[in-house]
């Protein structure tokens, strides 16, 4: 039965894979900016909103210099998985008010899912150690009110925007080190 399988084959040009990931991330960043603006117009935010279940921002811009590729991709994937879960929850449990953000919210979810698959592919192409399977996350409690759903939407889109902005900067910096 042939030789044992070797390590994952590294793509001839991992920079091209990284470029593709940067493009997807940047596109999703613009989508998120535009959708957050739409949300603010429909439901103006009274100050900043937080959601305890959201990931904390991975890194300040100033600390980007110390980043290493495996750590960035693993952390980014974990954070984006959390945001995907939150967007799915928002669409399911956010209430009738947030239906006015469809189909954009659905498009955002699909593109977030696509970016996650791209990150997974990039990690395998770069022969990076694959993260262990994600432990089942505790279910998110439904918002206590319609306004609770709107506040959650502000927090989710705001946090996702910051995460993606950090991701674009980080990925571009890492590209220069490949």
């Amino acid at each position: 039965p042939g030789p044992p399988p070797g390590p994952p084959r590294v793509s001839p040009d991992p920079r091209a894979e990284l470029d593709s990931t940067v493009l997807l991330t940047r596109s999703l960043l613009a989508d998120t900016r535009q959708l957050a603006a739409q949300l603010r117009d429909k439901f103006p935010a009274d100050g900043d909103h937080n959601l305890d279940s959201l990931p904390t921002l991975a890194m300040s811009a100033g600390a980007l210099g110390a980043l290493q590729l495996p750590g960035v991709l693993t952390r980014l994937r974990a954070d984006l998985l959390s945001y995907l879960r939150h967007v799915q929850w928002l669409r399911r449990a956010g209430g009738s008010s947030l239906k006015t953000l469809e189909p954009e919210l659905g498009t955002l979810q699909a593109r977030l899912d696509r970016l996650l698959r791209r990150l997974q592919l990039l990690m395998s192409r770069l022969a990076l150690p694959q993260p262990p399977p994600d432990p089942p996350a505790p279910p998110l409690a439904p918002p206590s009110s319609a306004w609770g759903g709107i506040r959650a939407a502000h927090a989710i889109l705001g946090g996702l925007h910051l995460t993606l902005d950090w991701a674009v900067r980080g990925l571009l910096l890492l590209k220069t080190r490949l």
Epitope: L23, S27, R33, Q34, A37, D41, P44, L172
Partner: antibody, heavy 120, light 108 residues
Framework: EVQLVESGGGLVQPGGSLRLSCAAS????????MHWVRQAPGKGLEWVAY????????YYADTVKGRFTISRDNAKNSLYLQMNSLRAEDTAVYYC?????????????WGQGTLVTVSS | EIVLTQSPATLSLSPGERATLSCSVS???????LHWYQQKPGQAPRLLIY???NLASGIPARFSGSGSGTDFTLTISSLEPEDFAVYYC?????????FGQGTKLEIK
């Protein structure tokens, strides 16, 4: 037919103020984000500011931040640009522009522009 | 800030010739956020091509756009007298929104 007509330009001294207006017609003004873009004499285009349909998100170019204020009155189908602390380098033709579709932030339709001259 | 660099600064051609204008972007940008405008002397700019390759309403089919990543191109297959103007590329993926410095297409 989409129409955008700018007004309010003129000659102003350095440090002075001016308020530009843009009257919109031919579309549902309250559904579209709007921009101001400027062009110095003989130079290229420079984006100045953007405002969403409901005025709750506003972006400015660094060159005008803190000095210019974009605003709109959806009931009057009007866009405004309040320009304070004017400098010689603000001399330009100022255009208002409408985005292509809601929240896409594009520059699909343009007015004919109004000239602002900052000089002593 | 994303910087767009257009080349050449001036292009001298005759009617009937093919024109190729380039726009080089300092960072990778998705193709749906790159647009082209035409401006004639004393007139406002007008949208020519949006999302890299889509013709705006009323724009003749001799205009076309292509490109990806950091390199984008506007092509005019056979120049008509009314095509001599200044052309600008623009990115809308990132704030601040930025324009290239323009390419002046002049009659040879």
């Amino acid at each position: 037919e989409v129409q955008l007509v700018e007004s309010g330009g003129g000659l102003v001294q350095p440090g002075g103020s001016l308020r530009l207006s843009c009257a919109a017609s031919g579309f549902t003004f309250s559904s579209f984000g709007m921009h101001w873009v400027r062009q110095a004499p003989g130079k290229g285009l420079e984006w100045v500011a953007y405002i969403t349909p409901g005025s709750n998100t506003i972006y400015y170019a660094d060159t005008v931040k803190g000095r210019f204020t974009i605003s709109r009155d959806n009931a009057k189908n009007s866009l405004y640009l309040q320009m304070n602390s004017l400098r010689a380098e603000d001399t330009a033709v100022y255009y208002c522009a409408r985005e292509y579709s809601s929240y896409d932030e594009g520059f699909a339709y343009w007015g004919q522009g109004t000239l602002v001259t900052v000089s002593s | 800030e994303i910087v767009l660099t257009q080349s050449p600064a001036t292009l001298s051609l005759s009617p009937g010739e093919r024109a190729t204008l380039s726009c080089s972007v300092s960072d990778l940008i998705p193709s749906q956020y790159l647009h082209w405008y035409q401006q004639k002397p004393g007139q406002a700019p007008r949208l020519l091509i949006y999302r890299t390759s889509n013709l705006a309403s009323g724009i003749p089919a001799r205009f076309s756009g292509s490109g990806s990543g950091t390199d984008f191109t506007l092509t005019i297959s056979s120049l008509e007298p009314e095509d001599f103007a200044v052309y600008y590329c623009q990115q809308g993926v990132d704030v601040p929104f930025t324009f290239g410095q323009g390419t002046k297409l002049e009659i040879k």
